[in-house]
């Protein structure tokens, strides 16, 4: 009876939610009723007992196979090498923060924060990004100067399209420069880092869109957008990379109550993109040039382009007035890298297929945590590695290229039975010498089985121990690439493996 009642409540609540959506009820009300529906469904699930339990990962999450991890580690390696090349230190912060730390920092995205069930008095939330925890870290430790990178998982209660590389639990790779420096030098370096990483990863042609929060705010002001609507109109403008101007305009006017003529004025600006010449053109704009904020932003962008030319990356950068990154904490330059799909028709512009890196300047965020409101200017970037993993994985699948999932350099094998002791001794010697080595966990494995494993695992070398070889004091070393087999004296084996795998001297 209880189960039937609960099923009826789930049915009722589902209908209730659908009704609210049809009535265009407020997002808050719909969210609450959806939360209730999920809670009722969860209780129904618990009620079903063990026999109906479906073994799967939670929505928006996934496991990584060894093959996927190998791809991921290569991507991370490229990113970390670049961050270190630019002199960054590394930090780590807790995966959950006090709820209060994250509250009010993300604007309309705040509803996507995961709150943890109360555990003894502290209200906690899973981190939504790495930037807010970084600002909290700076304020807490009274730091005014640091260049750091941080690679870690973040959590968002999104409805992700996992096929497009979007998840509820995903990695972010952040690089940030905190400190009071001359304008646009750190900002330019961040863009240089972004371009270096995206070029090194060889995932295709990309473009970095650049704008400035002050230009956006100035533009909204001169177009006649009320102050109270800046943030919400920003989030509409930010959709221009996905939907047409007409749809964005309809949202602004129909849903957000903007006057049509104000929306049209915004449309004149946000549909423009170009290079430094557009910056100069806008500095001459009769309306924008009267707005202090916009002029400051445009002046900084002009300087930024000078540095980008010196860094040799100006051809990768586009000043795009529709870029309006959704996070509340940006205060200055903002940027977003998109992967370009080549045009299908001649004469068409390349098409952006989703953000793969983004960032900007956030000079006020640290001050939100400092008791005296002391600000620490910050600028940074975040690499969208999940999207990149998806792209790299798809490319590898298409090419059917074999991906090695281990770094084993040599398999220790035996040609006859009763040689387990000799294999164990040899593999131990190799490990002690810093060689990556493996053996099969059988007392008397067949040589054919050992060689089959060696080939499938893509291990470069196999060291074969035989009774005759033991008497002669040699080991047979066979190469997977050349198929050649040579006898190597036992005492020269480590050196020979190192030479063949180009490995420098190292120990554990």
């Amino acid at each position: 009876a209880d189960r039937a009642a609960l099923e009826e409540l789930v049915r009722l609540q589902g209908a209730h939610v659908r009704g609210l959506k049809e009535q265009k009820a407020s997002a808050e009300q719909i969210e609450e009723e959806v939360t209730k529906l999920l809670k009722l469904k969860a209780q129904l699930g618990q009620d079903e007992g063990k026999q109906k339990f479906v073994l799967k990962t939670p929505k928006g999450t996934r496991d990584y196979s060894p093959r996927q991890m190998a791809v991921r580690e290569k991507v991370f390696d490229v990113i970390i090498r670049c961050f270190k090349r630019h002199g960054a230190e590394v930090i780590d912060t807790p995966v959950f923060e006090l709820k209060e730390t994250l509250t009010g920092k993300y604007g309309e995205d705040s509803k996507l924060i995961y709150d943890l069930k109360d555990q003894g008095g502290e209200l906690l939330s899973l981190r939504y990004d790495l930037t807010v925890p970084f600002a909290r870290y700076l304020a807490m430790n009274k730091l005014t100067n640091i260049k750091r990178y941080h690679i870690a998982k973040v959590y968002r209660r999104d409805n992700p399209a996992m096929t497009r590389g979007r998840y509820r639990e995903f990695y972010q790779c952040d690089f940030d420069i905190a400190g009071q420096f001359d304008p646009m030098i750190p900002d330019a370096e961040c863009l240089k880092i972004m371009c270096e990483i995206l070029s090194s990863l060889q995932i295709g042609n990309f473009l970095v869109k650049v704008n400035d929060r002050r230009i956006l705010d100035g533009m909204f002001a001169v177009c006649g957008v009320p102050d109270s609507k800046f943030r919400t109109i920003c989030s509409s403008v930010d959709k221009l990379d996905k939907v047409s101007w007409e749809e964005v305009k309809n949202e602004m006017v129909g849903e957000k109550g903007l006057a049509p003529e104000v929306a049209d004025r915004i449309g004149d600006y946000v549909q423009q993109h170009g290079g430094v010449s557009l910056v100069e053109q806008l500095l001459q704009d009769p309306k924008l040039s009267q707005n202090k904020q916009a002029v400051e932003g445009l002046g900084d962008l002009k300087l930024l382009f000078e540095y980008l030319i010196l860094f040799g990356i100006d051809d990768k950068i586009s000043f795009d007035l529709s870029l309006a990154r959704g996070l509340d904490y940006y205060t200055g330059v903002i940027y977003e890298a998109v992967l370009l799909q080549m045009p299908t028709q001649a004469g068409e512009e390349p098409l952006g297929v989703g953000s793969i890196a983004a960032g900007g300047r956030y000079d006020g965020l640290v001050g939100m945590f400092d008791p005296k409101g002391r600000k620490v200017p910050c600028v940074g970037l975040s690499i969208g590695v999940e999207r990149i993993f998806s792209i790299v994985e798809q490319r590898l699948e298409a090419s059917e290229e074999k991906v090695r999932t281990t770094e084993t350099q040599v398999l220790v094998a035996s040609a006859q039975k009763k040689l387990l002791e000799e294999r164990l001794k040899l593999v131990s010697e190799l490990w002690d010498a810093g060689i990556k080595a493996e053996l099969l966990y059988k007392k008397n494995p067949k040589l054919l089985n050992q060689l089959q494993y060696w080939e499938e695992a893509g291990i470069p070398l196999v060291a074969i121990i035989g009774e005759q070889e033991l008497r002669d004091g040699v080991i047979k070393l066979r190469s997977v690439a050349s198929r050649e087999e040579v006898d190597v004296r036992r005492e020269d084996l480590v050196e020979e493996i190192r030479r063949r795998t180009n490995q420098p001297l190292s120990t554990c």
């Epitope: 009642a5 609960l6 009826e8 409540l9 009722l12 609540q13 209908a15 209730h16 808050e28 609450e32 939360t35 209730k36 809670k39 009722l40 209780q43 709150d115 069930k117 109360d118 209200l123």
Partner: antibody, heavy 120, light 107 residues
Framework: QVQLVESGGGLVKPGGSLRLSCAAS????????MTWIRQAPGKGLEWVSY????????NYADSVKGRFTISRDNAKNSLYLQMNSLRDEDTAVYFC?????????????WGQGTLVTVSS | DIQMTQSPSSVSASVGDRVTITCRAS??????LAWYQQKPGRAPKLLIF???SLQSGVPSRFSGSGSGTHFTLTISSLQPEDFATYYC?????????FGQGTKLEIK
């Protein structure tokens, strides 16, 4: 055992304040939406306010909006109602109740009630 | 706000009688309806939720039916402990509202 116990009622002058508490035991308090419902002497029941288990959602009857504040402390298994600018018509027995199936706005467990009298 | 109207406002009956109380909603509330029993000086006790689901521990002589705007609570065979005031409540939308109550008295 599973129960709710209200406290904090009493006599207060119009314009005064009072804070009601409700102590929960015997169930996982943080899983449940909780509510305050009142009943004026000899009259029917009126739903005053509710709060979700995670604090995310609260709501108030128009008659108390801006004057009453609902809150909870999941660590202490307690529900509260802060009542300010009290009026004669707020005189009632105040019950705290738990939502059925955690989230459905029907009280399946009620406290014994605490009497609030607003009078000069 | 959704208005809930109960009828009758009071009813006299004897032990063993079958009693029906009606509740009407001013607009459709699907099956978002509960019935409570309240005795003097006590808190209300939940009898029925989702219009017809019997709360655990409540005797099977109590039953509920209806959907949309018209609902009934039926006590199939009155017992001495059933004499009390009965309230309906809509749980479809806030503010959740109660009927004015039906007092069930001994004839």
């Amino acid at each position: 055992q599973v129960q709710l116990v209200e406290s904090g009622g009493g006599l207060v002058k119009p314009g005064g304040s009072l804070r009601l508490s409700c102590a929960a035991s015997g169930f996982t308090f943080s899983d449940y939406y909780m509510t305050w419902i009142r009943q004026a002497p000899g009259k029917g029941l009126e739903w005053v306010s509710y709060i979700s288990g995670s604090f995310r959602y609260t709501n108030y009857a128009d008659s108390v909006k801006g004057r009453f504040t609902i809150s909870r402390d999941n660590a202490k298994n307690s529900l509260y109602l802060q009542m300010n600018s009290l009026r004669d018509e707020d005189t009632a027995v105040y019950f705290c109740a738990r939502y059925v199936y955690q989230v459905v706005a029907i009280g399946d467990l009620w406290g014994q009630g605490t009497l609030v009298t607003v009078s000069s | 706000d959704i208005q809930m109207t109960q009828s009758p406002s009071s009813v006299s009956a004897s032990v063993g009688d079958r009693v029906t109380i009606t509740c009407r909603a001013s607009q459709g509330i699907s099956s978002w309806l509960a019935w409570y029993q309240q005795k003097p000086g006590r808190a209300p006790k939940l009898l029925i939720f989702a219009a017809s689901s019997l709360q655990s521990g409540v005797p099977s002589r109590f039953s509920g039916s209806g959907s949309g705007t018209h609902f009934t609570l039926t006590i199939s065979s009155l017992q001495p402990e059933d004499f009390a005031t009965y309230y309906c409540q809509q749980a479809e939308s806030f503010p959740y509202t109660f009927g004015q109550g039906t007092k069930l008295e001994i004839k």
